[in-house]
């Protein structure tokens, strides 16, 4: 299980999101609300649950969250891009364990996800797309706390094989 | 200008090592992966690996683990890719390139080294 | 690995011609697929991302399209700067791979 647990470079992702989150939450219409229902829901996922938690959450913010959002700025359209692109890297990285079947998905794993795709499709689909933006700093709070994460000083000793 | 310039051509012996370069200019060289492609002469295109700029982490294909590495020097912008234990079918042009950051993301090599040369040849 | 077989190989077509040419997946790769483009002695070219997406600067003559397994790239007017060889690119699995190439000559 520990090859599933992803090695990557969170400084970088959350420093994105820090210059960006007030921007971000100020356009918040629905302050509220809440669409990954707080840490605690993500709080009592079990270690066998992480790695199928992560690829469902990661896959909520590339396939529906970064798709929906409409960015005017410039600057924040970059940072929020360049979030998207990590957890894209991310996302590939799960998968090599899902083909190595590695990454097994549990109906309490499911169910964490399916709340908070329900709670996305409560409210219009942009107000959704900045509320779930707003919110990263749970899921990378919930990456850190579950993940071997690397600072930017160490993450150069660490690298992934990829199979042939 | 944005570019991408690599190191120039390399003539080395079966069971040596190269490490080419890959110097970025014209933007946030820790703001794209960098992946290393290679193409031995006539033929198609293969994929060796991406190294993280920012971070200094690394995805290698399994058909080039243990023999390659993939290093950067973010105070001059530049990547590195070293091979090791040459063979004559390591004769290749050895590109770098770099990722697209898009919305929605996805992957694209929308830069590209101009290309290095590598003749293995005893 | 995953195999992305290319077709034709090779083809031959006039200025003006709509060209099309396919690429299959062994297995489903949703749309995480490129298309390229490469010269004699140059670099290749990014044309399309993420299966359809146009790539910024590349003529609308090029278009991309499909997911799964089936990808075609389409040339709606065959043009005297696109005669190359082309790329398909898959990035869903690793280790990412290309077709072998289909190489556009004049007719």
């Known amino acids: 299980l520990r090859r599933c647990l992803i090695s990557t470079d969170m400084d970088h992702i959350e420093d994105s999101f820090q210059e960006i989150k007030r921007a971000i939450q100020a356009k918040d219409t629905f302050p509220n609300v809440t669409i990954l229902s707080t840490l605690e829901t993500l709080q009592i996922i079990k270690p066998l649950d992480v790695c199928c938690v992560t690829k469902n959450l990661l896959a909520f913010y590339v396939d529906r969250v970064f798709k929906d959002h409409q960015e005017p700025n410039p600057k924040i359209l970059r940072k929020i891009s360049s979030i998207a692109n990590s957890f894209l890297y991310m996302q590939k990285t799960l998968r090599q364990c899902q083909e190595q079947r590695q990454c097994h998905c549990r109906q309490e794993a499911t169910n964490v996800t399916r709340v908070i795709h329900d709670n996305y499709d409560q409210l219009e689909v942009r107000s959704a797309a900045v509320k779930s933006l707003g919110e990263l700093d749970i899921f990378l709070a919930w990456i850190a706390k579950n993940h071997e994460v690397t600072s930017s000083a160490a993450a150069h000793h660490h690298h992934h094989h990829s199979g042939s | 200008q944005v570019q991408l310039v690599q190191s120039g051509a390399e003539v080395k012996k079966p069971g040596a090592s190269v490490k080419v370069s890959c110097k970025a200019s014209?933007?946030?060289?820790?703001?794209?992966?960098l992946h290393w492609v290679r193409q031995a002469p006539g033929q198609g295109l293969e994929w060796m690996g991406w190294?993280?700029?920012?971070?200094?982490?690394?995805n290698y294909a399994q058909k080039f683990q243990g023999r390659v590495t993939m290093t950067r020097d973010t105070s001059i912008s530049t990547a590195y890719m070293e091979l090791s234990r040459l063979r004559s079918d390591d004769t290749a042009v050895y590109y770098c390139?770099?990722?697209?950051?898009?919305?929605?993301?996805?992957?694209?090599?929308?830069?590209w080294g101009q290309g290095t040369l590598v003749t293995v040849s005893s | 690995a995953i195999q992305l077989t290319q077709s034709p190989s090779s083809l031959s077509a006039s200025v003006g011609d709509r060209v099309t040419i396919t690429c299959r997946a062994s297995?489903?790769?949703?749309?995480?697929f490129g298309w390229y483009q490469q010269k004699p002695g140059k670099a290749p070219k990014l044309l399309i991302y993420?299966?359809?997406s146009l790539q910024s600067g590349v003529p609308s003559r090029f278009s991309g399209s499909g997911s799964g397994t089936d990808f075609t790239l389409t040339i709606s007017s065959l043009q005297p700067e696109d005669f190359a060889t082309y790329y398909c690119?898959?990035?869903?699995?690793?280790?990412?791979?290309f077709g072998q190439g289909t190489k556009v000559e004049i007719k």
């Open positions: 390139a770099r990722d697209i950051v898009v919305l929605p993301p996805a992957i694209g090599f929308d830069l």
């Open positions: 993420a299966a359809s």
């Open positions: 297995q489903d790769i949703r749309s995480d």
């Open positions: 190294i993280n700029p920012n971070s200094g982490g690394t």
């Open positions: 690119l898959q990035d869903y699995n690793y280790p990412w791979t």
């Open positions: 014209g933007y946030t060289f820790t703001g794209y992966y």
